[in-house]
């Protein structure tokens, strides 16, 4: 039984330029139940905010609705994997909504 392996945010997609979804790949689970959370912050800010919607995009995803996509151009995201033995974090991903397709 080990802490979880490092997750990876591997893609973000915007089907309509009004919403976008990012997906991550879990690392190894360490043989224990693992919880995942995606947090984001604005460039130049340290205050972290949690994913508003883990449901819409399916498993291992975070969906940002119109009210989010319209408000900030850039998001810096990270996924945290946690089990009883510890935590691991993905690399930060810099997302500019302009370039999501």
């Amino acid at each position: 039984q080990l802490p979880p392996g490092k997750p990876e945010i591997f893609k973000c997609r915007s089907p309509n330029k009004e919403t976008f979804t990012c997906w991550w790949r879990p690392g190894t689970d360490g043989g224990l139940p693992t919880n995942y959370s995606l947090t984001y912050h604005r460039e130049g800010e340290t205050l972290m905010h949690e994913c508003p919607d883990y449901i819409t995009g399916g498993p291992n995803s975070c969906h940002f609705g119109k009210q989010y996509t319209s408000m900030w151009r850039t998001y810096i995201m990270m996924v945290n994997a946690t089990n009883q033995m510890g935590s691991s974090f993905s690399d930060e991903l810099y997302v500019d909504v302009t370039y999501i397709v």
Epitope: E18, E45, G65, Q67, S70, M71, W72, T74, V97, T98
Partner: antibody
Framework: EVQLLESGGGLVQPGGSLRLSCAAS????????MHWVRQAPGKGLEWVSL????????YYADSVKGRFTISRDNSKNTLYLQMNSLRAEDTAVYYC?????????????WGQGTLVTV | QSVLTQPPSASGTPGQRVTISCSGS????????VNWYQQLPGTVPKLLIY???KRPSGVPDRFSGSKSGTSASLAISGLRSEDEADYYC???????????FGGGTKLTVL
């Protein structure tokens, strides 16, 4: 320091038009969506419209749809609200607001407002 | 008629705990986060709570927010005279593709 300064309010006849402006400073205006929110005298807050950071998406309250147009000029750091076919019920203080420091949806900066009287 | 329903008034004495409710539907509160605003007499609205329960810097921890299903509430503990204000809830509405505010609650400190 973040500042939002509305202008363009005044007295207008029913059916008339008015264009409000909101001059922004102290932040990277073109990276943030902007809202207009209004408040009739002695009444509550009413959301009016939202424009995305790039101007590509706009949203309106049903009460103003087809009459009001939100726009922005990122080169001038200015937000606009073109109000046509004005009605008595549009009389209100109009605020521009944005989400700058808090999470992307909480309006944490507001202008002082400009009064529109129809 | 506001899409989000709040009691028009609430009151309490100094030191008391007061709760203000905000009721909506599946298209707004049920599927999106809630923000709360405070408007002191004669002033501009101020963000008090965002994402259901988070406080912006500078907001005292006497203010707390919660959400359950299609309703949200704002609690103010250790009530002070300076808390006398109008309080508004707000949420994005997926059906309307826009923001909706509650009608506001006037809080009186007796």
């Amino acid at each position: 320091e973040v500042q939002l300064l509305e202008s363009g309010g005044g007295l207008v006849q029913p059916g008339g038009s008015l264009r409000l402006s909101c001059a922004a400073s102290g932040f990277t205006f073109g990276s943030y969506g902007m809202h207009w929110v209004r408040q009739a005298p002695g009444k509550g807050l009413e959301w009016v419209s939202l424009i995305s950071w790039d101007g590509g998406s706009t949203y309106y309250a049903d009460s103003v749809k087809g009459r009001f147009t939100i726009s922005r000029d990122n080169s001038k750091n200015t937000l606009y609200l073109q109000m046509n076919s004005l009605r008595a019920e549009d009389t209100a203080v109009y605020y521009c607001a944005s989400s700058i420091s808090a999470a992307a949806t909480g309006l944490d900066y507001w202008g002082q407002g400009t009064l529109v009287t129809v | 008629q506001s899409v989000l329903t709040q009691p028009p008034s609430a009151s309490g004495t100094p030191g008391q705990r007061v709760t203000i409710s905000c009721s909506g539907s599946t298209s707004n509160i049920g599927s999106n986060t809630v923000n709360w605003y405070q408007q002191l007499p004669g002033t501009v609205p101020k963000l008090l709570i965002y994402e259901n329960k988070k406080r912006p810097s500078g907001v005292p921890d006497r203010f707390s927010g919660s959400k359950s299903g299609t309703s949200a509430s704002l609690a103010i503990s250790g009530l002070r005279s300076e808390d006398e204000a109008d309080y508004y809830c707000a949420a994005w509405d997926d059906s309307l593709s826009g923001w909706v505010f509650g009608g506001g609650t006037k809080l009186t400190v007796l």
